[in-house]
Interface confidence: low
């Protein structure tokens, strides 16, 4: 069967479709037809998009031509440019691909020209008269998302029949644009209609999960379910998975979320990604990647050892200075052969007794007025009153290797009466005295929140360090960390910069540009000026919430809010053309950066289909104004103002009869 005598056909990816309409039309008629369906003439700007067009067009008859969305006004030759002065009907000239059939002609370009694609061979581009009616045209439709084609079911009478928003009906789609309808006919007589809709959890999906056709319940093949099959009251079957597994997108098979999870140490099903990673005792999640585990340096925790501490992978050991020996608790030191540490032992027990109520603990907290200082490699306590210094408090970025805190000069030897915390590998690792790393600590029990006693005299509220409430929505409560109270004299909270947390409670994929099967944005490199934050995650900005009730006495609370930081695209690499014509690479001209897309997919608002016609270039603020389609003269006779928020350049159809008299090449395909 001649495909050119057949109905229109389309090829869809996850975010755009190309459709071939085998209808004889002029360029203007073709452009108008695509626009009326909510799309635009095709704009294959990359080798990958060209491949999709190739697969759709197939091997057509040798002489057939199809309009694509490229046109050039009279006297607009720019032969040195990749598009030779042609402009996409979306209004721009950005491209990473060209496929001209012939080298550029050196003439003066006296007439408006349009581009058609050969239906055979390598689908090269030919320029010719826009008023010529060619064999068909290619449209392109962008959309917010797509549903995968439905799996065939045992009880189906035939394949699902799909109807797209641009009125194409076929059984052959791999992806169905948002708004498509699937009609399934069942052997038992009744059928089902499904709509590709937005899902509450984000993305798009079919309005109903399978199975769609009433079969023989769960027999004979367990209803197609991998694990458990449940026969519902209405005769439908639904599938369930055994504990620790989750139902896959097909509604039938079961997945072990931890099987594919890239956790370095321990994985647990659940959480927004379907799994959450945990680290063994003595380790904590890496700040740059919560899937990896790094050794907790317990020696950085104030008071973890009474005198000296040595960290090793997975744990730590306490040591005592000469003349002292380590007590049985592995933490305290006493003079050799004496019981001199009993005072500190009592104080430590009072501070950290699990049975104490909050008031008592608070009193104990205020009982010790000593400061603490740090020497490289050794943590120890000093009972001297610290000077009233202002804390230079900053987020812990890679370039800030140490917090800028003017410590008093250390004294030696270390005293014996310092408060301490007991030997718990579960104690939060605070690698810098005041900055809390917002990653999942490995806590064996929610009943033992680690408290790090390093107190000073009661300070006015203005001088209290805010406490960070580090909440982890994707962790079970047993993994929630306790509050870390670290009171130092500090600047008033208003002067503190916002902390940037490196924890992302919900990891949504960045919006993807319309390409298939792996989407990308050609020619855009996005960088943020925030070290340590993955580029495809929106960082959380921790902002001060002074109006909130305090989490602990005399402490302000910092709560994480999912505030989107503006992401500023840096200078973008220029797009370059790919030419299938035998042109040497020296002829490849880079498109200047000024013509690059200025918008970032991650930040694009939800767009209507008419605004999605350009897969690479979202609308530029500096795009040129729409050109009004003209027929046989300068004044528009047709109301072609279709609603579209995107500035698009409509083609123009100049009366070319007069021009043809001057140039006999006008109506030929060059």
């Amino acid at each position: 069967q001649d495909p050119w005598a057949a109905e229109p056909r389309a090829a869809c990816g996850p975010s755009s479709c190309y459709a071939l309409f085998p209808r004889r039309r002029t360029f203007l008629e073709a452009w108008r037809a695509c626009r009326e369906l909510g799309g635009d003439l095709a704009t294959p700007r990359t080798p990958e998009e060209a491949q999709r067009v190739d697969s759709l067009v197939g091997a057509g008859p040798a002489s057939r031509l199809l309009w694509i969305g490229l046109q050039r006004q009279a006297r607009q030759c720019q032969l040195q440019r990749p598009l030779r002065g042609f402009t996409w009907t979306t209004g721009d000239q950005d491209t990473a691909f060209t496929n001209w059939a012939q080298p550029a002609s050196g003439g003066p370009c006296p007439a408006q020209r349009c581009v058609a694609l050969e239906a055979s061979g390598e689908h090269r581009w030919l320029e010719g008269s826009c008023t010529l009616a060619v064999d068909g045209y290619l449209c392109q439709f962008g959309f917010e998302g797509a549903c995968p084609a439905l799996q065939d079911e045992a009880g189906q009478a035939g394949p699902a029949v799909y109807t797209t928003p641009f009125h194409l009906v076929s059984t052959e789609f791999e992806w169905l644009p948002f708004g498509s309808v699937a009609a399934v006919q069942c052997q038992a007589g009744r059928g089902a209609s499904l709509l590709c809709v937005k899902q509450p959890e984000g993305g798009v999906g079919w309005s109903r999960a399978g199975p769609l056709c009433l079969g023989t319940g769960c027999s004979p093949d367990n209803g197609g379910c991998e694990h458990e099959c449940v026969e519902e009251v209405d005769g439908h079957v639904s599938c369930r998975c055994t504990e620790g597994f989750r139902l896959a997108a097909d509604g039938r098979s079961c997945e072990d979320p931890c099987a594919q999870a890239p956790c370095e140490q321990q994985c647990e099903p659940g959480g927004p990604q379907g799994y959450s990673c945990h680290c063994r005792l003595g380790f904590r999640p890496a700040e740059d990647d919560p899937h990896r585990c790094v050794d907790t340096d317990e020696c950085q925790i104030a008071g973890v050892c009474q005198q000296m501490c040595v960290n090793y992978v997975g744990g730590f050991e306490c040591y005592c200075s000469e003349g002292h020996e380590l007590e049985a608790d592995g933490i305290s030191c006493s003079p050799a052969g004496a019981m001199g540490a009993q005072a500190s032992q009592d104080l430590g027990d009072e501070l950290l007794d699990d049975g104490e109520d909050e008031e008592d603990e608070d009193e104990a907290w205020k009982a010790f007025n000593g400061g603490w200082t740090e020497m490289p490699g050794i943590l120890w306590m000093e009972p001297t009153q610290p000077p009233d210094f202002a804390l230079a408090y900053r987020p812990s970025f890679p370039e800030d290797r140490e917090p800028q805190i003017p410590y008093p000069e250390p004294t030696w030897p270390p005293p014996l009466s310092a408060p301490r915390v007991p030997y718990h590998s579960s104690v939060l690792s605070v690698t810098r005295p005041v900055v809390v790393s917002a990653t999942h600590p490995t806590l064996p029990s929610a009943h033992q929140p680690p408290v790090i006693p390093a107190t000073h005299p009661a300070l006015s509220r203005d001088h209290q360090i805010p406490v960070i409430a580090a909440n982890y929505p994707d962790l079970p409560s047993a993994y929630q960390p306790g509050i870390l109270s670290v009171s130092h004299s500090a600047q008033p909270p208003a002067h503190q910069p916002p902390m940037i947390s490196t924890k992302y409670p919900e990891l949504f994929p960045a919006h993807q540009s319309p390409m298939f099967p792996d989407t990308r944005v050609a020619g855009t490199q996005t960088t943020t000026h925030l070290p340590g934050i993955p580029p495809n995650h929106a960082p959380l900005v921790t902002t001060l919430g002074a109006q909130l009730p305090p989490q602990a006495p005399d402490a302000l609370v910092l709560r994480t809010q999912a505030t989107q930081l503006p992401i500023i695209p840096t200078a973008q690499p220029s797009l370059t053309t790919t030419s299938r014509s035998p042109v040497s690479p020296a002829h490849q001209i880079s498109v200047p950066a000024a013509t690059q897309p200025a918008a970032l997919p991650t930040l694009l608002p939800s767009q209507s289909p008419t605004n999605q016609t350009s897969p690479i270039s979202p609308t530029h603020p500096h795009s040129k104004a729409p050109q009004i389609p003209r027929e046989d003269g300068p004044s528009p006779k047709l109301a072609l103002w279709l609603p579209s928020p995107a500035p698009t350049a409509a083609p123009t159809a100049l009366g070319e009869a007069g021009l043809a008299e001057h140039s006999q090449r006008d109506d030929r395909w060059l």
């Epitope: 697969s55 091997a59 990473a96 792996d518 020619g523 490199q525 690499p573 220029s574 790919t578």
Partner: antibody, heavy 116, light 107 residues
């Protein structure tokens, strides 16, 4: 699971022909470009040929144009490379790869030795 | 044809080190540059597509950057398992071309 399995390699004399096959499974074969890539110890990785989704569009490196033919049987989910007029410089391990611009899945490779 | 030049040819590192591998194109390839890893006696495996997008299942220790003609593959905290040859490839224009590769060895 995506799988590509090549077959048909071996020893062949210069000037003779050989046909390689690649059986594909685990994905919708008709939706993907496919390619052959070869690797000779002296030359590193070398793209040989690609075919469009329908098999109608084919691309070849200059040194094999006119001698090699890439084709596909969508019904059988199989990719082929017909190699005629073989030369000693065609000696290499030939990989079948799924190609959407980049090569995201590769077969285990099949060794072709052209020698008299 | 677009020629891709990789450097160094061989790189010998200590486990735990961070290394950078370079790939330079004779003409701009836009963002159509990809990286592969090939372990001894194995088929190549896609690491990075389109300059910096990690392929699924690739450890986050592997990252890449660049644009136009200069590209870099970075490997943090090198492990024994990373002993491989690393190739860059362009899909900007036919013929598709690969770099000659960088061989990573462990001291």
């Amino acid at each position: 699971e995506v799988q590509l399995v090549e077959s048909g390699g071996g020893l062949v004399q210069p000037g003779r022909s050989m046909k390689l096959s690649c059986s594909a499974s685990g994905f919708t074969f008709r939706n993907y470009y496919m390619a052959w890539v070869r690797q000779a110890p002296t030359r590193g990785l070398e793209w040989v040929a690609s075919t469009g989704t329908g098999g109608d569009f084919t691309y070849y490196r200059d040194s094999v144009k006119g001698r090699f033919t890439i084709s596909r049987d969508t019904a059988e989910n199989t990719l082929y490379l017909q190699m005629d007029s073989l030369r000693s410089e065609d000696t290499a391990t030939y990989y079948c790869a799924r190609a959407y611009g980049y090569f995201d899945y590769w077969g285990q490779g099949v060794k072709v030795t052209v020698s008299s | 044809d677009i020629v891709l030049t990789q450097s160094p040819t061989t790189l010998s590192v200590t486990p735990g080190e961070t290394v950078s591998l370079s790939c330079r194109a004779s003409h701009s390839v836009g963002t159509n540059l990809h990286w592969y890893q090939q372990k001894p006696n194995e088929s190549p495996r896609l690491l990075i597509k389109y300059v910096s997008q990690s392929n699924s299942g690739i450890p986050s220790r592997f990252s890449a950057s660049g644009s136009g003609t200069d590209f870099t593959l970075n490997i943090k905290n090198v492990e024994f398992n990373d002993v491989s040859s690393y190739f860059c490839q362009q899909t900007q224009s036919w013929p598709l071309t690969f770099g000659a590769g960088t061989k990573l060895e462990i001291k």
